[in-house]
Interface confidence: medium
């Protein structure tokens, strides 16, 4: 397993609709054709997997159908969007990138993006 640098923004504020987007960029040392991206959430010293996707370079990023994450890839950058966030989901969201194929296997873990989520007040009769 070889180390790889991963960069992501330090802080992101979720929209009032509970959607947060950030870029995860990795310094690919080789010509990877298969990449796996995982988003981890760290809060109160616990780490939980939020979502994960494997993609072939040049193709769309595909998360599970019932994932709260969506994303697109462009070169060594992955644009990640997390939807359905509430105030209690505030925390550090860490981007983990694995170059799966061809060998050698590379692993990179970012320092994390602190996502702040503020719950909007309900608007009776006009909005959910």
């Amino acid at each position: 397993c070889k180390a790889m640098h991963v960069a992501q923004p330090a802080v992101v504020l979720a929209s009032s609709r509970g959607i947060a987007s950030f870029v995860c960029e990795y310094a690919s040392p080789g010509k990877a054709t298969e990449v796996r991206v995982t988003v981890l959430r760290q809060a109160d010293s616990q780490v939980t997997e939020v979502c994960a996707a494997t993609y072939m370079m040049g193709n769309e990023l595909t998360f599970l159908d019932d994932s709260i994450c969506t994303g697109t890839s462009s070169g060594n950058q992955v644009n990640l969007t997390i939807q359905g966030l509430r105030a209690m989901d505030t925390g550090l969201y860490i981007c983990k990138v694995e170059l799966m194929y061809p060998p050698p296997y590379y692993l990179g873990i970012g320092n994390g993006t602190q996502i702040y989520v503020i719950d909007p007040e309900p608007c009776p009769d006009s909005d959910f």
């Epitope: 159908d65 969506t70 939807q83 359905g84 509430r86 909005d127």
Partner: nanobody
């Protein structure tokens, strides 16, 4: 207490279309994850489609992809399931579900256990 009311079910010939509606009342959050589930006689309840009412990308079960479309009208506090090219195997009771999701996204957006609020269901029958 959040209440959900489905409508739009009925009987249709194979290849036909139906549009289901689900209206939310007495809501306590501004945005929800909402989903359509279905349950055929003698089978487990299964997810069909899900959407975050704050926007973002809907999710679909394989059985629904390309035929069903989930959408939301926030002004009317309503979500819809447009069902085209219906097949006899789509015959089931269709349920609407809602959840504010906070901290529980790891269950997936089409997991039965991920939803707190449920409607009474609307019957869809597709004959050949």
């Amino acid at each position: 207490q959040v209440q959900l009311q489905e409508s739009g079910g009925g009987s249709v010939q194979a290849g036909g279309s139906l549009r289901l509606s689900c209206t939310v009342s007495q809501h306590t959050s501004r945005y929800y994850y909402m989903a359509w589930f279905r349950q055929a006689p003698g089978k487990e309840r299964e997810g069909v489609a899900s959407i975050w009412t704050g926007g973002g990308t809907p999710g679909y079960a394989d059985s629904a992809k390309g035929r069903f479309t989930i959408s939301t009208d926030n002004a009317k506090n309503t979500i819809y399931l447009q069902m085209n090219s219906l097949k006899p195997e789509d015959t089931a009771m269709y349920y609407c579900a809602a959840d504010d999701r906070g901290g529980r996204w790891s269950l997936g957006t089409m997991a039965v256990g991920g939803y707190k609020y449920w409607g009474q269901g609307t019957q869809v029958t597709v004959s050949s």
